[in-house]
Interface confidence: low
Amino acid sequence: FERTRSLQDPCSNCPAGTFCDNNRNQICSPCPPNSFSSAGGQRTCDICRQCKGVFRTRKECSSTSNAECDCTPGFHCLGAGCSMCEQDCKQGQELTKKGCKDCCFGTFNDQKRGICRPWTNCSLDGKSVLVNGTKERDVVCGPSPADLSPGASSVTPPAPAREPGHSPQ
């Protein structure tokens, strides 16, 4: 029965960019301005997203696809489809309710977003601090003092920085 009904449903013939207009004998009408339908057979068109305030238009709305927003300079996207914009901070800072604040001693943030994280504790791995940490950079761990005897292998270079956007939020 479902299959028979769908075959007879005139709305199923309405393509994306149109809607099945019940007020006009179920004929396919184009989506009105500032609305869209991304799939066929829809009985209504969805209102286009408006990018306003801190949001900028990255892609205009069309009859078949919604607008896409990104954030104005000084802010970055959060959430699916850039549903929120969050203020950037400088490296060495984190965002708090009172705006961007410097990382406390013993913590760092090497990105414009995210939170300050504790410096690596080199001694947990039996290593020593080769380069001191800063608000912007983690410490660099070197070999333990015992490894620094003549003939010991050279210091392993630090791992490459993490990809942007992968710090815990």
């Epitope: 997203r49 408006q50 305030g53 549903s83 929120m84 914009c85 969050e86 309710k97 009172k98």
Partner: nanobody, 122 residues
């Protein structure tokens, strides 16, 4: 639908005053922190001030502290920004925004007004 409409902007001389208003609708106004932001010509957006839902928690950017006063009237669903001792560097489009996060500058996409222009010039 959330709607925020700013008004009260205009041209004012340095040292002058303006009062901005933001009329809110489509949500329970008293439940939300509200903020003012501004964007000077060719610059990024800057947070100006916020106020908690009940009005008991308030903070200001250092650049406006002592000159600007944020307030709200929950009975009228309105947010205000009283701006005194205005300077040329206060020239900007001012936006009110509903905050859905405890972090300044993190706001839901729809919760912004269209802005009102404040020009401070002699």
């Amino acid at each position: 639908e959330v709607q925020l409409v700013e008004s009260g902007g205009g041209l004012v001389k340095p040292g002058g005053s303006l009062r901005l208003s933001c009329a809110a609708s489509g949500f329970t106004f008293s439940d939300y922190y509200m903020s003012w932001f501004r964007q000077a010509p060719g610059k990024g957006l800057e947070w100006v001030s916020y106020i908690s839902g009940s009005g008991d928690i308030i903070d200001y950017a250092d650049s406006v502290k002592g000159r600007f006063t944020i307030s709200r009237d929950n009975a009228k669903n309105s947010l205000y920004l009283q701006m005194n001792s205005l300077r040329a560097e206060d020239t900007a489009v001012y936006y009110c925004a509903r905050e859905d996060s405890r972090l300044t500058g993190t706001t839901d996409f729809d919760n912004w007004g269209q802005g009102t222009l404040v020009t401070v010039s002699s």
